[in-house]
Interface confidence: medium
Amino acid sequence: QAACPESWIGFQRKCFYFSDDTKNWTSSQRFCDSQDADLAQVESFQELNFLLRYKGPSDHWIGLSREQGQPWKWINGTEWTRQFPILGAGECAYLNDKGASSARHYTERKWICSKSDIHV
């Protein structure tokens, strides 16, 4: 079990924060960064299913974005390897009640931060 700070949820050696507030994509990442985290990077189907299950019905930003005409990239700069479909024509990805979709960066949504768990 992950050792996570208060208000963070552990899953498979990572800690996740599910916001109550809403922000645009950029402000959401700034919040995550200030918490020694990043907008969530989804590394497996199990993780995706956990996030979809835990976040409830609201849309939540995750750490995928793309420049115009460029491939999707995670926050840390690595390219997305098409682990799951992303619907829509926006430049920033979020999780909805069915999976992943995309929207313009200035729209406001809840968000999910992720970071590695604390090894004591």
Epitope: P5, A37, D38, N76, G77
Partner: antibody
């Protein structure tokens, strides 16, 4: 290994703009696992963090409240460098200015592990 | 802003002995604390980050401890090159990083 090389004038007139540049070798200014900071040091104020820029799919800037209205930190990806601009300087801005690199290892920040050589800036007419 | 207070301002210790430097934060910074060593005319050098992790190339006679608001840097078996000024710095979640005023470690 990562190295930072600073350049810029050592004397700035009051009310003018202080401009310093920090050239990065051994890393990229748009690295997803670093933040690039400016720090200054003076006998009266000690070590003072001024601000930072970093890239996480988009560029972010954060500034200290004491200089927020006067400061700009800008990355230049084509030259792999970042710069500091401090407007409307006064003699209180006289200090040694350092550029620094902060690691972000697996989302967690560490300390300021790489420093430039420092630039002594005097604000005087 | 978080205020960092270091004590003592000056510490006199003999070579070969142990030095203990303290740093206190005005509010919790979790383990987001670093220690630096600075010698005259040089940039500060990172010794410890995350309150207790040694930076690359730092000898194991340097160790850090603490979390929340109270932190300690311990230097065992002091070598002549260890006499310098030491600073603590918080890099907690406010993103407004602040340094302590420094402790000068001098030869007794």
């Amino acid at each position: 290994q990562v190295q930072l090389q600073q350049s810029g004038p050592g004397l700035v007139r009051p009310s003018q703009t202080l401009s310093l540049t920090c050239v990065i070798s051994g890393d990229s200014v748009s690295s997803g696992s670093a933040a690039w900071n400016w720090i200054r040091q003076s006998p009266s104020r000690g070590l003072e963090w001024l601000g930072r820029t970093y890239y996480r799919a988009k560029w972010y800037n954060e500034y200290a409240g004491s200089v927020k209205s006067r400061i700009t930190i800008s990355p230049d990806t084509s030259k792999n460098q970042f710069s500091l601009q401090l407007n409307s300087v006064t003699p209180e801005d006289t200090a040694v200015y350092f550029c620094t690199r902060q690691d972000k290892d697996n989302t967690r920040y560490s300390g300021l592990g790489v420093w430039g050589q420092g630039t002594t800036v005097t604000v005087s007419s | 802003d978080v205020v960092m207070t270091q004590s003592p301002a000056t510490l006199s210790v003999s070579p070969g002995e142990r030095a203990t430097l303290s740093c206190r934060a005005s509010q919790s910074v979790s383990s987001n604390l670093a220690w630096y060593q600075q010698k005259p005319g040089q940039a500060p050098r990172l010794l410890i980050y995350g309150a207790s992790s040694r930076a690359t190339g730092i000898p194991d006679r340097f160790s850090g401890s603490g979390s929340g608001t109270d932190f300690t840097l311990t230097i065992n078996r002091l070598e002549p090159e260890d006499f310098a000024v030491y600073y603590c710095q918080q890099y907690g979640s406010s993103s407004m990083y602040t340094f302590g005023q420094g402790t000068k470690l001098e030869i007794k």
